[in-house]
Structures are given as structure tokens and as C-alpha cells.
């Protein structure tokens, strides 16, 4: 099978998911690719409990999550429905601000220093969090 029953080395298990927290920065697309090569995805926050868990691990540092509106509407990278799902934006965010002078608006979401979300320029080199789900019915041994 291709499922996971336990988390890879250096990943943190929480509520049937595995999380990896970067300590350096990349642009959103590069962080996204990094997670995909780990057979994972940028973190998708589905509850206040998961928000607090991630916030505890990243501290007060701008950190990318798997939420963007590069193609129009806001979308989670794993297909989780944005409209009906958990949200934790800062007041008056997202605002697709154009005043940064870098060209275009702001299409990628990140955790801010207080954990609440902001949209920002996707090229900014922020830290990131990868997430992958654990599956119960695995025939594969744990990753070593």
C-alpha cells in the first residue's frame, strides 16, 4: 500500500496527520513543491484546534499555509472547501493589497506573528508547514 501508519523522521504527529515545520524560507510555490516532493501538501487548517497546534509550533513568524487565490477564488491545496471551512483572517484581510510595489496583488495566505492569517505576495520567502495524513489500513512498514 501507499498509505502511512506513522510519521517520517523529523515530522510531528497530531490528530492522525504528520506535520513538518521549516526553519528557513521559500516563496509559496517553492514551498508547495517542497511539500509535494515529500508526498505531502502545505498545511490545510480545518479547525481551531489545528490552528492552535500549528501556531504553537511556528511561533510568531510569518509562515505559508496551503491556501491561495492565484486562479481567482480562494482554494485549499487539498481541495478542502474554503467557503464552508475554518477561517482565521486578521481584521480586514484578505485585502489583495497592491501597494507593496512588487507588482500584482496578494494571492497567498500565511500565518502572521499572532497566528491570524493574512494574504501576501507569493514570492516572499516565508517559512512553511507541510502536512500529510495518516491512514489506518497500511501494509507498508514505518518510514525509517
Amino acid at each position: 500500500g501507499s498509505e502511512r501508519t506513522c510519521c517520517p523522521v523529523n515530522w510531528v504527529e497530531h490528530e492522525r496527520s504528520c506535520y513538518w515545520f521549516s526553519r528557513s524560507g521559500k516563496a509559496w510555490a517553492d514551498a508547495d513543491n517542497y511539500c509535494r516532493l515529500e508526498d505531502a501538501h502545505l498545511v490545510v487548517v480545518t479547525s481551531w484546534e489545528e490552528q492552535k497546534f500549528v501556531q504553537h509550533h511556528i511561533g510568531p513568524v510569518n509562515t505559508w499555509m496551503g491556501l491561495h487565490d492565484q486562479n481567482g477564488p480562494w482554494k485549499w491545496v487539498d481541495g478542502t472547501d474554503y467557503e464552508t471551512g475554518f477561517k482565521n483572517w486578521r481584521p480586514e484581510q484578505p485585502d489583495d493589497w497592491y501597494g507593496h510595489g512588487l507588482g500584482g496583488g496578494e494571492d497567498c495566505a500565511h500565518f502572521t506573528d499572532d497566528g491570524r492569517w493574512n494574504d501576501d505576495v507569493c514570492q516572499r520567502p516565508y517559512r512553511w508547514v507541510c502536512e500529510t495524513e495518516l491512514d489506518k489500513a497500511s501494509q507498508e512498514p514505518p518510514l525509517l
Epitope: 501507499s2 526553519r23 528557513s24 521559500k26 510555490a29 517553492d30 516532493l37 508526498d39
Partner: antibody, heavy 121, light 109 residues
């Protein structure tokens, strides 16, 4: 001992196909993304393709996109590169390489010895 | 695309010399820079990762420095086995680029 061993290279005509293999040993193969990197005679290194540890994600250099397919069989600890519509400019030594990670830094930390692919009529 | 440019493209030196090779990136890649050594007919070998971290088993005469767009590989006291071609590689946006520099050939003077 950690080892990668490529095979499947040879002489092929333009427009032809070839399948390269890379047998891995000495590490948990399914835990690591794997790449193909090539080197034309007398030239530098060119990354070709990469596949995630469980095969869910693949990426290709623009120069081979639509012609080459990377795959893996974790039960056999083997990486593959299916090369179709081969061109003279694909002539190179093809290396398989393991994607190692320290922190968030990715590097090719283990390389095979390479297999030569010659595209000529 | 990020372009990686090495200088010089070739270099003659003697055993015991101190040698420095430079790699420049066309945009900021922070410390996402690796160095490889390749001897004729052999596969490349990882020397330095994250700009300055020495790969396990690599002699301490090799060192790397730099960040942003300019990086250097230094061999403090050149040994006979160090004559080879050296490549830098950015790992900021890998994939889909994984760009290597064009290489620096280190030859015996």
C-alpha cells in the same frame, strides 16, 4: 552501503525509445524523492526529472516534458526513466540521484555511476 | 529562471595552493546553494550543502561561504586528488529548476 546502479543505456535512433533503470540499495528507498540528472559529452550537469518517494508527484525539465516519464517501483527499490521521441541532443550520461534533505536544504547526496545514452542514426 | 554563473570556467593551480571558486545567482537564493566535485568518468559528489555545511566524509580543507547571490568554494591547501571539475547548484526553487552552474575545471599548473 548506500548504492545506486543505473542500467538500460545504449545506442538508439532519433525518434526511438529507451527505458533506463536505477536499482537502489542501502537506504529506505520509498522515503526519498529521486531524480535523473544528465551530462552531455564534455558539457555540464542538467537536471531532467524528479519523483516523490511514493510516486505521487513528478516534475520535468522543459527540455524533456511530454517525451520522458519518470516512475518508480518501491517494492523493487527501482527508479525508471522512460524516454520517447529521442533526439540527438538527448545524448548524454544519465545519472540517478537521491534527494537528500538537511533542514530545508535539498541536495543530491547519492549518485549512481551513470549510463550512456547515444541518439544517432 | 534562476541562472547560476561560475567563475573562472577553468583554473590552473599547484598542490598546496589556496583556491577559490565563485558562483553567482541571478536572483537572491539565500543560502540554498550546494557544491559538487566531479572527476573524469565519475559521478558528481556532494561537497557542501546550504552554502557552508560540509557533507559527511568531505575533508575539512573544503569550505563554502556566501549568501544571497554570491557564493564561494575554497580549498585551503590543494591536494593532488582535488583536481576535478566543480559545480554549484541552487536549491531554492527545486523543482522545477535545480539549476547547476556551468562548472569550473581545476587543473594542475
Amino acid at each position: 552501503e548506500v548504492q545506486l546502479l543505473e542500467s538500460g543505456g545504449g545506442l538508439v535512433q532519433p525518434g526511438g525509445s529507451l527505458r533506463l533503470s536505477c536499482a537502489a540499495s542501502g537506504f529506505t528507498f520509498s522515503s526519498y524523492a529521486m531524480s535523473w540528472v544528465r551530462q552531455a559529452p564534455g558539457k555540464g550537469l542538467e537536471w531532467v526529472s524528479v519523483i516523490s518517494g511514493r510516486g505521487g508527484s513528478t516534475y520535468y525539465a522543459d527540455s524533456v516534458k511530454g517525451r520522458f516519464t519518470i516512475s518508480r517501483d518501491n517494492s523493487k527499490n527501482t527508479l525508471y526513466l522512460q524516454m520517447n521521441s529521442l533526439r540527438a541532443e538527448d545524448t548524454a550520461v544519465y545519472y540517478c540521484a537521491k534527494r537528500g534533505i538537511v533542514g530545508a536544504t535539498e541536495a543530491f547526496d547519492i549518485w549512481g555511476q551513470g549510463t550512456m545514452v547515444t541518439v544517432s542514426s | 529562471d534562476i541562472q547560476m554563473t561560475q567563475s573562472p570556467s577553468s583554473l590552473s593551480a599547484s598542490v598546496g595552493d589556496r583556491v577559490t571558486i565563485t558562483c553567482r545567482a541571478s536572483q537572491n537564493i539565500y543560502s540554498y546553494l550546494n557544491w559538487y566535485q566531479q572527476k573524469p568518468g565519475k559521478a558528481p559528489k556532494l561537497l557542501i550543502y546550504a552554502a557552508s555545511s560540509l557533507q559527511s566524509g568531505v575533508p575539512s580543507r573544503f569550505s563554502g561561504s556566501g549568501s544571497g547571490t554570491e557564493f564561494t568554494l575554497t580549498i585551503s591547501i590543494l591536494q593532488p586528488e582535488d583536481f576535478a571539475t566543480y559545480y554549484c547548484q541552487q536549491s531554492y526553487n527545486t523543482p522545477p529548476e535545480c539549476n547547476f552552474g556551468q562548472g569550473t575545471k581545476l587543473e594542475i599548473k
